[in-house]
């Protein structure tokens, strides 16, 4: 971003208001909805992005789970409470005083309750499985080329350290990207896998969060990779706590 007033923008988050009124005349950008100052050299947290998007229409989905503890975002959009660092607060409530606990990616991990509901800690989502189906192509993509391209994408576009891309699986037409990041592995300045997955999800839907950058143009050896559908599964360091009624 640049100090020249007309060009003071946030390359990594178009849902911001920017002005060169930061310290020393620095271009400073604040997330819409929350007014929190964001670091435009890296991804903005999913919580602040959801807060900025609060007026957007609901986007409810129901997904098949790969195992009993995997969570999916069935609840769609909501206006989250974020802490001063932009992380999700462990307990989220709506205007009708219905509350629930969320994980570090903001996905509900308990039954809904009232204001007496306690969420002792923000439980970290340490494993994310991104399940993609690509549009039909003349032939299957070469697995190692596909693996390399997706790793490059997460490294260069989302600035995610390569060590956090655990694996890329491929069985035409299904691609699975596994992201893993334990609390102990995440150093200061590391992009969170939840934020990278959210940016990727929005990119794939043609709703890029990047400022003025073209949409996602994924190519494997020149062949376009067009995604038909995306399912994202979230696994937490501590299994979620739902009543049996919900599981049946």
């Amino acid at each position: 971003h640049t100090a020249a007033q007309d060009n003071c923008t946030c390359p990594t988050n178009k849902m911001t208001v920017c002005s060169p009124d930061g310290p020393g005349g620095r271009c400073q950008c604040r997330a819409l909805g929350s007014g929190v100052a964001v670091d435009c050299s890296t991804l903005t947290s999913k919580c602040l992005l959801l807060k900025a998007r609060m007026s957007a229409p609901k986007n409810a989905r129901t997904l098949v789970r790969p195992n009993e503890h995997a969570l999916v975002d069935n609840d769609g959009l909501y206006d989250p409470d974020c802490d001063p660092e932009g992380r999700f607060k462990a307990r989220q409530c709506n205007q009708t005083s219905v509350c629930w606990c969320v994980n570090s990616v903001g996905v509900r991990r308990t039954d809904k309750g009232d204001l007496s509901l306690r969420c002792d800690e923000l439980v970290r989502t340490h494993h994310i499985l991104i399940d993609l189906r690509h549009r039909p192509t003349a032939g299957a993509f070469n697995h190692s080329d596909l693996d390399a391209e997706l790793r490059r994408l997460f490294r260069e576009r989302y600035r995610l350290h390569p060590k956090f891309v655990a694996a890329v699986h491929y069985e035409q037409p299904t691609i699975q990207i596994e992201l893993r990041q334990n609390t102990s592995q995440k150093a200061a300045g590391d992009v969170d896998i939840g934020d990278a997955a959210y940016y990727f999800e929005r990119d794939v839907k043609g709703e890029s969060l990047f400022q003025g950058r073209g949409g996602l143009d994924l190519r494997v050896r020149g062949e376009p990779l067009q995604v038909e559908r995306t399912l994202i599964y979230y696994l937490d360091e501590i299994p979620p706590k739902f009543s049996m009624k919900r599981l049946t």
Partner: antibody, heavy 120, light 107 residues
Framework: QVQLVQSGAEVKKPGASVKVSCKAS????????INWVRQATGRGLEWMGW????????GYAQKFQGRVTITADESTSTAYMELSSLRSEDTAVYYC?????????????WGQGTMVTVSS | DIQLTQSPSSVSASVGDRVTITCRAS??????LAWYRQKPGKAPKLLIY???SLQSGVPSRFSGSGSGTDFTLTISSLQPEDFATYYC?????????FGQGTRLEIK
């Protein structure tokens, strides 16, 4: 070329005020903020405050709050720093500086400095 | 206010030497750090901004690194014009603050 040219040296008595000017040229004045930094002889750099000439927003270091006023005249592309209630410890070289084009809060263009001496 | 502490306060070196100056912030400042060189009677000159980005026109012998609280300015091979005072400066939060300076002298 891009430059900031400051007014000449000043000698003031304790309790008086001083107004230093900083004329910008070579770029669009209202596109960039102006910072003021001072340096006493043999000492380090001390940031005093800043102004965005387009919005009129200002920010001052707590130490100078109430004593310093930064203004700008768009028509002449000139910024001003006025320091009141002068004391001997305000004797210093006063610099104006422009933030870098990258918007990173670093100062890439500096004035040549104005020596202000406060002496009875 | 964020305090910036430079070390060493002064250093003696010879032309061709490699010199490293450090700047420690009292709290995290992300990468909002700049480095300047100042010669006697002159205004400071910007060398490095955003902790590691080289200012246009500055020789490549200057490099910066670090983020958070610990930062380094390295001059890979000292030239005669490099004997001066060096300052770090943060722009993470108001007020902008500078380090106390490091004097680089000829040995």
């Amino acid at each position: 070329q891009v430059q900031l040219v400051q007014s000449g040296a000043e000698v003031k008595k304790p309790g008086a005020s001083v107004k230093v000017s900083c004329k910008a040229s070579g770029y669009t004045f209202t596109n960039y903020g102006i910072n003021w930094v001072r340096q006493a002889t043999g000492r380090g750099l001390e940031w005093m405050g800043w102004m965005n000439p387009r919005s009129g927003n200002t920010g001052y270091a707590q130490k100078f709050q109430g004593r310093v006023t930064i203004t700008a005249d768009e028509s002449t592309s000139t910024a001003y720093m006025e320091l009141s209630s002068l004391r001997s410890e305000d004797t210093a070289v006063y610099y104006c500086a422009r933030p870098n084009t990258g918007g990173d809060g670093a100062f890439d263009i500096w004035g040549q400095g104005t020596m202000v001496t406060v002496s009875s | 206010d964020i305090q910036l502490t430079q070390s060493p306060s002064s250093v003696s070196a010879s032309v061709g030497d490699r010199v490293t100056i450090t700047c420690r912030a009292s709290q995290g400042i992300s990468s909002w750090l700049a480095w300047y060189r100042q010669k006697p009677g002159k205004a400071p000159k910007l060398l490095i901004y955003r902790a590691r980005s080289l200012q246009s026109g500055v020789p490549s012998r200057f490099s910066g690194s670090g983020s958070g609280t610990d930062f380094t300015l390295t001059i890979s091979s000292l030239q005669p014009e490099d004997f001066a005072t060096y300052y770090c400066q943060q722009a993470n939060s108001f007020p902008v603050t500078f380090g106390q300076g490091t004097r680089l002298e000829i040995k």
